[in-house]
Interface confidence: low
């Protein structure tokens, strides 16, 4: 158990932060998005799901160092944390044919990364090792997106592993170990 930084496969490292995100004020409704009784969704309210522009999805700047084992990037990188509840800024009445209760089987929008950018970083290693060059993929923008089965399975449910994304011209990477395997590794770190 615990939060010790750990390496959970050959390529993904959970680093230590250099600075801290400061989430801006939430909506007037302070209910959290992740309360157990809501199954990870906002509280049940009738609303129209079509106008995504009304949704509240914020981009928080987040500065961190990239690490690879004992090596650390010479400079911190800045990326975005996507934060916020993808529900309308104002709730619409449940008029016949207009309103829809938010429910597990209904449309599900989440505030998730929309665009990424690649950045080359130089990793400095202890013991006189030569610096390593690495390319990292950083979140560049966030958006309220309607979930597809792909989002559900590979991006949202398993925070502990990398999403297996087939890349053009490459064989798909085998899927990383499950969150349970990562948790076990974490527990063994103590």
């Amino acid at each position: 158990q615990g939060w010790q930084a750990f390496k959970n496969d050959a390529t993904e490292i959970i680093p230590e932060l250099g600075e801290y995100p400061e989430p801006p004020p939430e909506l007037e409704n302070n209910k959290t998005m992740n309360r157990a009784e809501n199954g990870g969704r906002p509280p049940h309210h009738p609303f129209e799901t079509k106008d995504v522009s009304e949704y509240s999805c914020r981009e928080l700047h987040f500065t961190r160092y990239v690490t690879d084992g004992p090596c650390r990037s010479a400079k911190p990188v800045t990326e975005l944390v996507c934060s916020g509840q993808c529900g309308p800024a104002r709730l619409l009445p449940n008029a016949i044919g207009r309103g829809k209760w938010w429910r597990p089987s209904g449309p599900d929008f989440r505030c998730i990364p929309d665009r990424y950018r690649a950045q080359r970083v130089q990793l400095l290693c202890p013991g006189g090792e030569a610096p390593r060059a690495r390319k990292v993929r950083l979140v560049a923008s966030c958006k309220c997106k309607r979930l597809t089965r792909f989002h559900n399975q590979s991006e949202l449910k398993d925070f502990g592993t990398e999403a297996a994304r087939p890349q053009k011209g490459r064989k798909p990477r085998p899927r990383a170990r499950s969150a349970k395997a990562n948790q076990a590794e974490l527990e063994n770190a103590y």
């Epitope: 959970i14 690490t67 975005l80 990364p113 993929r137 979140v139 994304r165 969150a179």
Partner: nanobody, 126 residues
């Protein structure tokens, strides 16, 4: 998903002390930083203190430096806010926050999220 449960709020006289706790459960191995934020009636939510879950790096807003102390217990997956020399202006609802960010080296990524607890009321009377 990550669940955050705060406790320790209450009514205290000016100059007194309180200790807030925030217990995290769920996908805690994805959390990189945790923090305490507060919101007084009619005001915006503001950062009070944050701490990284691995290295324990801390950050405080100017108005609480020297009075408040944030700490963590990695075995219990809990973050604490020790509040000393409380002032009436510290009265607010205090929220626990967990921020996560995916990936490091490599192309595969998972999305980043910020989670909030339900809040605990702290009232400082003069």
């Amino acid at each position: 998903e990550v669940q955050l449960v705060e406790s320790g709020g209450g009514l205290v006289q000016a100059g007194g002390s309180l200790r807030l706790s925030c217990a995290a459960s769920g996908s805690i191995f994805s959390i990189l930083t945790m923090g305490w934020y507060r919101q007084a009636p009619g005001r915006q939510r503001e950062m009070v203190a944050t701490i990284t879950t691995s290295g324990g790096l801390t950050n405080y807003t100017d108005s609480v430096k020297g009075r408040f102390s944030i700490s963590r217990d990695n075995n219990k997956n809990t973050v604490y806010l020790q509040m000393n020399s409380l002032k009436p202006e510290d009265t607010a609802v205090y929220y626990c926050n967990a921020a996560m960010v995916g990936g490091g080296v490599g192309l595969g990524r998972r999305p980043s999220f910020s989670y909030w607890g339900q809040g605990t009321q702290v009232t400082v009377s003069s």
